[in-house]
């Protein structure tokens, strides 16, 4: 449905002098009153005009009036200096009514034909104003047939008078500690008929300070105090103002955390208004003095409510509140002028007593028991039997509270057992089974399970043995009774070890030959290394050069001796390596199945027999001396041989350890 009044009936028509187009009579007076609908005006023009000309049109005339105003008095045919004829002019009513009066006097010197005029109602464009006139609307004017309406820009609302735009300037709340506020449109003239309210609301403890800046221009009166437009400032303590005129008001220190600013304007005037810059202050907190070995940040001239500072300690010092360490420290100034937390201390970092090093010791370098920042300690391993793995053992107490090595490691160094040490200098000469002396075979391990077997100690928590020797216990590792550090099989004086897990080579098939006859036992605890318990070395890549045909290896164990009984004392035998083809051929004939000797085996013994390992020796190490490192290494594991140990033309067969180095290393590193 269209807005505005009901569509009006058309208003238009014709007017003419009496008798037109003939001459008009004397002493005539005719009056027409034309009315247009509200919001419309009347337009009138003449198509014919012929009246007697007289000075100031005193005799005959047509008078056009709109309300009380005479629009024109017309006579003659053409305008003169003092008289006006309509010519082609168009006349408009000022409002919606137009009065037309025609008068003729008592005589005419000659005949005159009078006038003809046409009129019509047309819409008034109220939005069009003459220069110098006040605009119809404050902001936007919208004309329509029969009327107009005003609208306002965003942030304003149309006043009840339907023309003025009042500013929507109430309810603004300022909560920052400083800011600016001004009259609407500043520095352009402020709006009329507006009532603005601004609130500054800070946390309790703050005090607002108001400064009028730049310019101040609010409509005033010479005698009465701010009767038209005014600015008032209200706090919970007092009221300031009203303010008007052109003088900047003085600074106002409100001593309050809440301020309400009211600005009221009337319907007239053209003034630029005001601008306020506000700040705040509060009761300052005591100046923070940094603790020794610390500093304050940020550094300020003063600290007031909500201001904060942090304490940072110098490298090597840590924050302590009382006796408790702090990760960080920040204090905030409160409304009563006190800090919310007491000042902490910066205390020298203490790394604490260093951890004990298994199989090693620690020495305080800086001073006895000194464990504070930059203190130095020295770890070392127990001489002879342990060596430190890739580390110089020097640790420094660093700022993070950790003992740290020169390589930046925080973990302890590792004392690795020295391998391959023996009281024996060399084998060299071939001779029969001999009794071992203390320290000759410190890697020798006695394994008691279902049967008697042997093994060799690797590192300080692994035993290398033959798969067939521990196969029955692979799922019951704890059933293995592992003994070391003794020469006598039945002696009560030995070091006891227990198995945590048994790892049998996945290529070993029980009761189907002896290929891949190798196993590892993980001990549940590390053993202490000494002259009687020392691990055997694993072969280096270059070890094959010490294991050629006729090179001497040494086998040791408590297995069957020539007398057919298990040895009471650890025995050993020095035996040469046998050519692989020769050994393969020796086991080609019955009762041995073809292919008994594989590339994963090596053979050792005398062609004439008499020197061999035997039942009970299984799993023990066949060792060789690495003349370059002067360490003994395991080349073979006692695996199998002829039915009759030491038989002529037959040889002892050993698992070739060098083929299994990756397997051994993988198991040990994974577990």
């Amino acid at each position: 449905t269209p807005l505005g009044p009901k569509w009006p009936e058309p208003v238009f028509g014709r007017l003419a002098s009496p008798g037109f187009p003939g001459e008009y009579a004397n002493d005539q007076e005719r009056r027409w009153t034309l009315t247009a609908p509200p919001g419309y005006r009347l337009r009138l023009y003449f198509t014919h005009f012929d009246l007697e000309l007289s000075h100031l049109c005193e005799y005959d005339f047509v008078k056009l009036s709109s309300g009380a105003k005479v629009l024109a008095t017309l006579c003659g045919q053409e305008s003169t200096d003092t008289e006006r004829a309509p010519g082609k002019d168009t006349f408009y009513s000022l409002g919606s009514s137009l009065d037309i009066t025609f008068r003729s006097d008592y005589s005419n010197e000659k005949p005159f034909t009078g006038f003809e005029a046409f009129y019509a109602a047309e819409d008034i464009d109220e939005c069009q104003v003459a220069p110098g006139e006040a605009p119809t609307c404050d902001h936007h004017c919208h004309n329509h047939l029969g009327g107009f309406y005003c609208s306002c820009r965003a942030g304003y609302v149309l006043h009840r008078n339907k023309r003025t735009c009042s500013a929507l300037c109430s309810g603004q709340v300022f909560t920052q500690r400083s800011g600016e506020l001004s009259s609407p449109e500043y520095p352009r003239p402020y709006p009329k008929l507006s009532s603005c309210t601004y609130s500054i609301s800070l946390e309790e403890g703050f005090s607002v300070i108001l400064d009028f800046v730049e310019s101040f221009d609010v409509e005033t009166h010479p005698e009465t105090l701010c009767p038209y437009d005014f600015l008032k400032i209200q706090t919970d303590r007092e009221e300031h103002g009203p303010f008007c005129g052109k003088t900047l008001p003085h600074r106002i220190e409100t001593k309050s955390n809440t301020v309400t600013i009211t600005f009221v304007t009337d319907e007239s005037g053209d003034h630029t208004g005001w601008k306020i810059h506000y700040t705040s202050t509060a009761q300052p907190c005591p100046y923070p003095m940094a603790p020794p070995n610390g500093h304050v940040s940020p550094v300020q001239a003063k600290y007031i409510l909500k201001d904060s500072f942090s304490i940072f300690c110098e490298t090597g010092y840590e924050l302590l509140q009382g006796h408790l360490p702090l990760k960080s420290f920040t204090a905030v100034c409160q409304k009563d002028g006190s800090w919310d937390r007491p000042m902490p201390a910066c205390s020298i970092v203490d790394c604490g007593p260093p951890d004990d090093l298994p199989s090693g010791r620690v020495e305080y370098i800086t001073g006895p028991g000194v464990t504070t920042y930059k203190a130095v300690i020295q770890y070392s391993c127990e001489e002879t039997f342990y060596t430190m793995k890739v580390n110089d053992g020097k640790y420094v107490c660093e700022a993070d509270g950790f003992w740290t090595s020169s390589k930046g490691e925080k973990s302890l160094p590792v004392c690795e057992p020295v391998c391959g040490l023996s009281a024996r200098t060399t084998g060299g000469r071939i001779y029969g089974g001999q009794k071992a002396k203390p320290g000759d075979f410190p890697w020798q391990v006695l394994i008691l399970g279902g049967t008697t077997a042997a093994g060799a100690l690797l590192y300080d928590n692994w035993v290398l043995t033959a798969a067939h020797a521990v196969y029955e216990q692979k799922h019951d590792a704890s059933a293995l009774d592992i003994r070391m550090g003794t020469l006598k099989r039945l002696s009560p004086h030995y070091t006891q070890a227990w198995s945590e897990a048994v790892f049998i080579h996945e290529g070993y098939t029980h009761d189907a030959g002896f290929d891949n006859d190798i196993a590892l036992i993980k001990l549940n605890n590390k053993v202490v290394i000494n002259s009687n318990i020392t691990p055997i070395c694993l072969p280096r890549k270059e070890a094959e050069s010490f294991m050629r045909t006729d090179d001497i290896g040494t086998a040791s164990g408590w297995g069957l001796t020539q007398r057919g009984f298990l040895a009471r004392n650890l025995m050993y035998v020095d035996i040469p390596i046998v050519d692989h083809q020769k050994c393969t051929a020796a086991y080609e004939k019955p009762p041995y199945p073809r292919g008994s000797v594989t590339a994963n085996m090596l053979c050792a013994g005398l062609e004439s027999g008499g020197k061999d390992s035997c039942r009970g020796d299984a799993g023990g190490a066949l060792v060789f001396l690495d003349s370059e490192t002067e360490r003994w290494f395991v080349g073979g594991i006692v695996s199998w041989g002829s039915m009759n140990c030491g038989e002529a033309g037959q040889y002892g067969v050993y698992t070739k350890v060098i083929n299994y180095i990756p397997w051994i290393e993988n198991i040990i590193s994974d577990f």
Epitope: H323, P325, L326, K327, R341
Partner: antibody, heavy 118, light 107 residues
Framework: QVTLKESGPVLVKPTETLTLTCTVS??????????VSWIRQPPGKALEWLAH???????SYRTSLKSRLTISKDTSKNQVVLTMTNMDPVDTATYYC??????????WGQGTLVTVSS | QPVLTQPPSVSVSPGQTASITCSGD??????AYWYQQKPGHSPVLVIY???KRPSGIPGRFSGSNSGNTATLTISGTQAMDEADYYC?????????FGTGTKVTVLA
């Protein structure tokens, strides 16, 4: 060798006051940045800190129990005493004393079970 | 009293890594401490000041703390690590313990 040992009644009646004593050895209650804390653990529940006292005599209490707790130390006897007034069956718990060093509670007593029942 | 929230339980296979979280408002701004408690025993400090290990605590225990969460990590978990674990932090000068997490090492 650092040790702490709690002693006190095994059974307390409701409304009564509990007094627990912690006797320490292996460290000093008067020197160093050390403190002693009391912690309790109701059966089958989590640990609950109660109070602590440092060598400087600085004390602190659990907010919700502040009005009922008092901690003190007797340096000459190497003892820390905790009293807890107006005992209630919900206070039934194992009460531990423990040493504080560098913010960590690094040595604990074996604990004493206190039952509150009429 | 502020609240430190832990998952009630965590299960892990032997040799695998167990992670226990402890959540609290701005916990990363404070130091976190971790305790292990086995049934019938007193708690044992395993990590102090977020990531430091006391003497005698195995290297498989490690800690971290940032944002709102502290984490205790047990790498290569062993059967003997089955226990209740509690986090703890200091709020001003009062100690706050976590709700506790039961770590189960699967057979």
């Amino acid at each position: 060798q650092v040790t702490l040992k709690e002693s006190g009644p095994v059974l307390v009646k409701p409304t009564e006051t509990l007094t627990l004593t912690c006797t320490v050895s292996g460290f000093s209650l008067s020197r160093g940045k050390m403190g002693v804390s009391w912690i309790r653990q109701p059966p089958g529940k989590a640990l609950e800190w109660l109070a602590h006292i440092f060598s400087s005599d600085e004390k602190s209490y659990r907010t919700s129990l502040k009005s009922r707790l008092t901690i003190s130390k007797d340096t000459s006897k190497n003892q820390v005493v905790l009293t807890m007034t107006n005992m209630d069956p919900v206070d039934t718990a194992t009460y531990y004393c423990a040493r504080i060093r560098r913010g960590g509670i690094d040595y604990w007593g074996q604990g004493t079970l206190v039952t509150v029942s009429s | 009293q502020p609240v430190l929230t832990q998952p009630p339980s965590v299960s892990v296979s032997p040799g695998q890594t167990a992670s226990i979280t402890c959540s609290g408002d701005k916990l990363g701004d404070k130091f976190a401490y971790w305790y292990q408690q086995k049934p019938g025993h007193s708690p044992v400090l395993v990590i102090y000041q977020d990531n430091k290990r006391p003497s005698g605590i195995p290297g498989r225990f490690s800690g971290s703390n940032s944002g709102n969460t502290a984490t205790l990590t047990i790498s290569g978990t062993q059967a003997m690590d089955e226990a209740d674990y509690y986090c703890q932090a200091w709020d001003s000068s009062t100690a706050v313990f976590g709700t506790g997490t039961k770590v189960t090492v699967l057979a």
